[in-house]
């Protein structure tokens, strides 16, 4: 008995498509081995038609594919534009056709129902619009025009030119009679329902001279598109419902076990709380199409999703829909990273953001999710160095540690910084991730002076106190600019025995600027790191003024416990629409913080550390 399983019998009609799902035991070997669909010939050999390795035979070209779902232990063979020639015996299997695990499938393609001669076939998705064309002769031009639906042996009047409308079609059907000379009338049916499916008869005139035309209307439920995404990653549902509903409210919903559809998000402002912080409904284009992005995918996000349009912002029969079946792969390529990062008021956070390691050159971005309306995610910082003005001096995006992860550091935290942030790149959109920043009770671990005024030409010393728990960390000072934070050169003061025992007086790393120049004005960060992994930071703003009195300026370590003064910046930056998430290059026109120029003038700046384990906190 083969462990591979699927439908033994599949029957369909010409022109239609089938989607054949084959199940296999999801062992590690099975998940990664070749999957195939082959046709059994008279000789007993099974000729491959499509495989998971990308092979598609010539008579399947452009109409078939095979998709493996290793997480579920299934693969799906889709075959479109079926013809009678496709009838036959097939196998779906794993490994090699002749001796792998396989399952026999019989496919029968029939001609479909016999239709009256000259029948026009209309195939339309549910919720869409159909226009049935009905020709007539000149002598029937002044006579009554009508459309009937054939139900069994009877014909039921649907609409006629005397203003009759069948109640089942109320408010969604119209009969159009053109001007003189045009011998055709049309019946337009909007918001098609599954129950509209069937054979129709157009009629002009009556008696033996009447004109008749048959129309076969096939109303199809949309086949769900199979979407397979990684745990912790991102999915985008692109929804194009047509111009007819361009100005109607849009929604995305998820089908529940009762076969109703729970709204996930809609354009009327409704959003499921389970998607808080990780969903955006991107604004519509002129054609009414829109997209919904969900990040931080969880296993429980799996299911059938429908997008649609209706004035109520939820699913209603007879309105256009699109469908997806979302599978979430637990064997994710996206590494685990904290979904919640905690910081204290006045302190800092360092957020690790994953990206596709194959796209190391991609531009990296960090944005703040805002839940108002359909959601927005204005960019705060990007790897090219653009930073929103109100984050000047306290936000930096670093390429480290690299190889699939970048770091975002935000300091001078306030309760206003609590919220959801997205990591993204201009490359693989499936690697968008969400992190929530929470502000908790506590004190910052690193202490720097609140603000410092340096005197031109003199020496400035800024102390940074750190607790014993950071004794093994590398300490550094850097000068912030909108392109990053340039580590300052260090000056080794030699070993300090006192530090080995974590002496109270030795937990200090100092920045020395000598002599102070105009270019030294700006933000400086004191921080700790382990290798390429960044820890806490503290920021201090250095203002430079003209010399008033002689002598060097030294900021006493005793003053360093003062909470840093919060620098209030103009926050009137132009809103960035979340549409730009689709193509982050759209952010290029954003107002940027001016580059602060000279990166602290090289050797004039030095970092003194009383730690024996470090080289003055410099970053190599």
């Amino acid at each position: 008995k083969s462990p591979v399983f699927g439908p033994q019998e599949v029957s369909s009609v010409e022109g239609n498509s089938v989607s054949i799902k084959c199940y296999y035991p999801p062992t590690s070997v099975n998940r990664h081995t070749r999957k195939y669909w082959c046709r059994k010939g008279a000789s007993g050999r099974c000729i491959t038609l499509v495989s998971s390795e990308g092979y598609v035979s010539s008579n399947y070209a452009g109409r078939a594919n095979l998709t493996n779902f290793p997480e579920n232990g299934t693969f799906v063979v889709n075959i479109a534009q079926l013809s009678r020639d496709d009838s036959g015996h097939y196998k779906c299997g794993l490994g090699i056709n002749s001796r792998g695990l396989s399952f026999d499938v019989s496919l029968e393609v029939s001609q479909g129902p016999e239709l009256p001669n000259g029948t026009e076939v209309y195939t339309v998705d549910v919720g869409r619009t159909v226009t049935i064309k009905c020709p007539f002769k000149t002598e029937n031009a002044p006579k009554t025009k009508a459309l009937y639906k054939k139900i069994g042996q009877t014909s039921v009047l649907v609409i006629d030119s005397r203003n009759y409308v069948n109640p089942n079609y109320k408010d969604r059907i119209r009969l159009r009679i053109p001007g003189t000379g045009q011998l055709i009338f049309t019946v337009v049916i909007d918001r098609l329902r599954l129950s509209d499916h069937g054979l129709y008869l157009c009629q002009a005139g009556d008696g033996s001279n009447r004109d008749e035309k048959n129309a076969d209307l096939q109303v199809l439920e949309p086949e769900p598109e199979l979407v397979y995404e990684d745990l912790r990653g991102s999915v985008t549902f692109h929804c194009a419902l047509g111009l007819e509903v361009a100005n109607v409210a849009k929604f995305l919903c998820r089908v529940n076990s009762r076969e109703t559809c729970d709204v996930v998000i809609n354009t009327l402002g409704k959003r499921d709380s389970a998607f808080e912080g990780r969903i955006l409904l991107n604004p519509q284009d002129k054609d009414g199409s829109f997209s919904v992005v969900i990040t931080g995918l969880r296993k429980e996000d799996e299911g059938r999703y429908l997008c649609g349009a209706h004035s109520d912002g939820q699913l209603q029969e007879g309105w256009p829909i699109q469908a997806w079946q979302l599978f979430v792969n637990e064997e994710s390529t996206i590494p685990r990273s904290p979904t919640v990062v905690k910081g204290v008021a006045g302190g800092s956070v360092a957020v690790l953001c994953p990206y596709n390691p194959k796209e190391s050159q991609s531009l990296k971005y960090w944005c703040l999710w805002e839940g108002a309306q359909n959601g927005r995610c204005p960019l705060l910082v990007e790897s090219q160095g653009l930073v929103q003005e109100q984050y000047e001096g306290r936000l930096s995006l670093l390429q480290e540690p690299g190889n699939g992860t970048f770091t975002v550091i935000l300091n001078q935290l306030t309760t206003q910084d609590a919220g959801f942030y997205w990591c993204l790149t201009n490359g693989d959109t499936r690697w968008r991730t969400t992190v929530e920043i929470k502000i908790i009770e506590g004190e910052p671990n690193l202490k720097v002076p609140g603000n410092v005024t340096a005197v031109l030409g003199e020496t400035l010393n800024i102390p940074c106190h750190f607790p014993c728990k950071f004794s093994s960390y590398e300490k550094y000072w850097c000068k912030w600019s909108n392109t990053g934070c340039q580590t300052l050169p260090s000056q080794d003061e030699g070993p300090s025995e006192a530090f080995v025992n974590c002496d109270e007086n030795s937990r200090l790393v100092s920045l020395t600027l000598n002599p102070v120049t105009r270019a030294d004005e700006g933000w400086y960060w004191c921080g700790v790191k382990q290798g390429h992994f960044y820890g806490e930071t503290a920021a201090v703003y250095v203002a430079v003024e003209e010399k008033k009195v002689a002598g060097s300026r030294y900021v006493s370590p005793a003053k360093a416990d003062a909470a840093p003064d919060e620098k209030v910046l103009d926050s009137g930056v132009r809103e960035i629409e979340n549409k730009a998430i689709q193509d982050p290059r759209l952010f290029a026109e954003e107002k940027v913080v001016a580059d602060t120029g000279d990166q602290a003038g090289g050797s004039r700046a030095s970092v003194d550390s009383s730690s024996s384990e470090e080289q003055g906190g410099s970053s190599k």
């Epitope: 399983f5 439908p7 033994q8 019998e9 599949v10 029957s11 369909s12 009609v13 239609n16 498509s17 089938v18 989607s19 054949i20 199940y23 299934t74 479909g112 599954l194 096939q218 199809l220 439920e221 086949e223 089908v255 076990s257 076969e259 299911g303 059938r304 079946q325």
Partner: nanobody, 127 residues
């Protein structure tokens, strides 16, 4: 409210035939996957056959033990599911259940995939 009602069970001789029916109401029959399972006392429910529709295509699934002897069919107009059983064997004796899976995406053979169940109909095959 979803209701599945089985009928057609009974006592037959080995090699006889029997047709089971299941009347479904309250669910989108044509866009659901419908299955037949059976259970003997003290054992788990086991998969017998299933049928699914998509557009104008039909998919039929059978357990190896009934393949070639049982035929599953459905009438979308009447919302009924049938199981034609031929060449019955004593080991086919069980309570037969009709099941519906409107979501259509779990493993067709797994009872947990199906949200709705009938009350069952007894089939007894004597030798």
């Amino acid at each position: 409210e979803v209701q599945l009602v089985e009928s057609g069970g009974g006592v037959v001789q080995a090699e006889d035939s029997l047709r089971l029916s299941c009347a479904a109401s309250g669910l989108p029959f044509s866009s659901s996957r419908m299955g037949w399972f059976r259970q003997v006392p003290g054992k788990e429910r086991e998969f017998v056959a299933a049928i699914g529709w998509s557009g104008r295509s039909t998919y039929r699934y059978y357990d190896d033990s009934v393949k070639g002897r049982f035929t599953v069919s459905g009438d979308n107009a009447k919302n009924t599911l049938d199981l034609q059983m031929k060449g019955l064997k004593p080991e086919d004796t069980a309570v037969y259940y009709c099941a519906a899976d409107p979501n259509y995406y779990g493993d067709v053979r797994t009872s947990g995939t199906y949200q709705y169940w009938g009350q069952g109909t007894q089939v007894t095959v004597s030798s």
